[in-house]
């Protein structure tokens, strides 16, 4: 019962986490204009992984996609890649974990197979969560670096007369969504891995049955056979982990009233 609960909870937590990772990846507010200690502009800038937006005090919001691939910073490309890998792994993990759920019966699937699938999805969720956390952290680091660089050169001009005030960017909502979502996916993955241990059937201790034939004593030990197939308790963890690792390798606008905050 506890195993089913752990597995179910792990699935739900991972599902919420992956939904959050998808949401964060699609969000426009990865970096937002720093309003602290800045002249009060009637224009608010914010940027996402795919486009940058400008919201005017009039309520009009204009977003422009990054229509270049080669012209984008390598770090931004890396963040995009990490987030996409996280989403793909998470989605496959969800698919696998649905079939692995103890409460769902599919044909004559044995518990051992479900245990394998649970561990596989667990590992996928862990990697997915790590990808999201890494992606968000790389972007955050990029922001911090740029923030201090632009603070150092905040006022540029000739003869002390201020000509240009550089726009500084700070952490946007998407970063926090990404961190939380990545963490949830990671936790869900760990829960799935824990659930996997309880899913694999324990070895049944049968008494050795002796058959006497033509004076020779031959003992058949069912447990020994079970062990040799990889379902016995002595090798189950290693066997399932191998299966898990193998699977992992294979997967290698006019303004509206809500526009202005």
């Amino acid at each position: 019962m506890a195993v089913t609960a752990c597995q179910g909870l792990g699935f739900v937590v991972s599902l919420i986490g992956i939904a959050g990772i998808i949401a964060a990846t699609c969000m426009d507010q990865w970096s937002t204009q720093d309003l602290y200690n800045n002249p009060v502009t009637a224009v608010f800038n914010y940027q996402g992984l795919w486009r940058s937006c400008v919201r005017e005090s009039s309520g009009f919001t204009e977003c422009r996609g990054y229509f270049t691939l080669l012209g984008l910073p390598a770090m931004l490309q890396a963040v995009r890649a990490l987030m996409i890998v996280g989403i793909v792994l998470g989605a496959i993990g969800l698919l696998v974990s649905i079939f692995a759920l103890k409460c769902i019966r599919i044909g004559s699937m044995e518990d051992s197979a479900k245990a394998n699938m649970t561990l596989t999805s667990g590992i996928m969720f862990i990697v997915s969560g790590l990808c999201a956390i890494a992606g968000v952290s790389v972007f955050a680091n990029m922001l911090v670096t740029n923030f201090w660089m632009s603070t150092a050169n905040m006022y540029t001009g000739m003869g002390g007369m201020v000509q240009t005030v550089q726009t500084r960017y700070t952490f946007g909502a998407a970063l926090f969504v990404g961190w939380v979502a990545g963490g949830l996916t990671l936790i869900g993955g760990v829960m799935m891995c824990i659930a996997c241990r309880g899913l694999a059937p324990e070895e049944t201790n049968y008494k050795a049955v002796s058959y006497h034939a033509s004076g020779h004593s031959v003992a058949y030990k069912p447990g020994g056979f079970k062990a040799s197939t990889g379902f016995g308790s002595n090798t189950k963890n290693k066997k399932i982990y191998d299966g898990g690792a193998r699977t992992e390798d294979e997967v290698q606008s006019y303004p509206s009233k809500h526009d202005y905050v």
Epitope: T41, A42, V43, S58, G59, F60, T167, D259
Partner: antibody, heavy 115, light 113 residues
Framework: EVQLVESGGGLVQPGGSLRLSCAVS?????MNWVRQAPGKGLEWVAW????????TYADDFKGRFTISRDDSKNTLYLQMNSLRAEDTAVYYC???????????WGQGTLVTVSS | DIQMTQSPSSLSASVGDRVTITCKSS????????????LTWYQQKPGKAPKLLIY???TLESGVPSRFSGSGSGTDYTLTISSLQPEDFATYYC?????????FGQGTKVEIK
């Protein structure tokens, strides 16, 4: 079609108060009050987000003037307190548009501060 | 506050003339986010409310004749009337639409020569 109609102007004594109204028909996200003293240029007074009610004022009017709106009546207001002779002007309400330009203006209402 | 300085303060011209009004801001009105300059031009005739001509320094408001054009970036901006018409005799104002408080230039009066 957006229409803006101001009212509430008139003669007031120095130190007195006056409330200007601007009836708004049509879609508006944010609104402004702009004034023009006789024979002088345009002077921006205040801005308001018509949905959140968030205001912003020019430094000269902070504390004396209050911009507000009534959602139910679709009306914009400018409450003017501690009026001075130099506040004598035609007051316009104007709608903010793309590029933060003011695309629709009212006909203006004259406020005269004199003893 | 941002200072907006217009020049000349007044000018005399004839119908058909090319007229240029300049506006200088004390700070750049260029927004890095969309590479647009938040400078607006208005026309005002005596006893009337101002009329929006140009926003984003060079974008013509709908219904405004194409003889009006705007240019410039950063701190220096220009309003040009390619061929002055009788109805164009008025006062023209530039406005900072980037920083609060929004500030207007002192105006340029275009009179008949």
């Amino acid at each position: 079609e957006v229409q803006l109609v101001e009212s509430g102007g008139g003669l007031v004594q120095p130190g007195g108060s006056l409330r200007l109204s601007c009836a708004v028909s049509g879609y508006t996200f944010s609104m402004n009050w702009v004034r023009q003293a006789p024979g002088k240029g345009l002077e921006w007074v205040a801005w308001i987000n018509m949905y959140t009610g968030e205001p912003t004022y020019a430094d000269d009017f902070k504390g004396r003037f209050t911009i507000s709106r009534d959602d139910s009546k679709n009306t914009l207001y400018l409450q003017m307190n501690s009026l001075r002779a130099e506040d004598t002007a035609v007051y316009y309400c104007a709608r903010s548009s793309r590029g933060n330009g003011f695309d629709y203006w009212g006909q203006g209402t004259l406020v005269t501060v004199s003893s | 506050d941002i200072q907006m300085t217009q020049s000349p303060s007044s000018l005399s011209a004839s119908v058909g003339d090319r007229v240029t009004i300049t506006c200088k801001s004390s700070q750049s009105l260029l927004n890095s986010g969309n590479q647009k300059s938040y400078l607006t031009w208005y026309q005002q005739k005596p006893g009337k409310a101002p009329k929006l001509l140009i926003y984003w320094a060079s974008t013509l408001e709908s219904g405004v004749p194409s003889r009006f054009s705007g240019s410039g970036s950063g701190t220096d901006y220009t309003l040009t009337i390619s061929s002055l018409q009788p109805e164009d005799f008025a006062t023209y104002y530039c406005q900072n639409a980037y920083y609060f408080p929004f500030t207007f230039g002192q105006g340029t009066k275009v009179e008949i020569k």
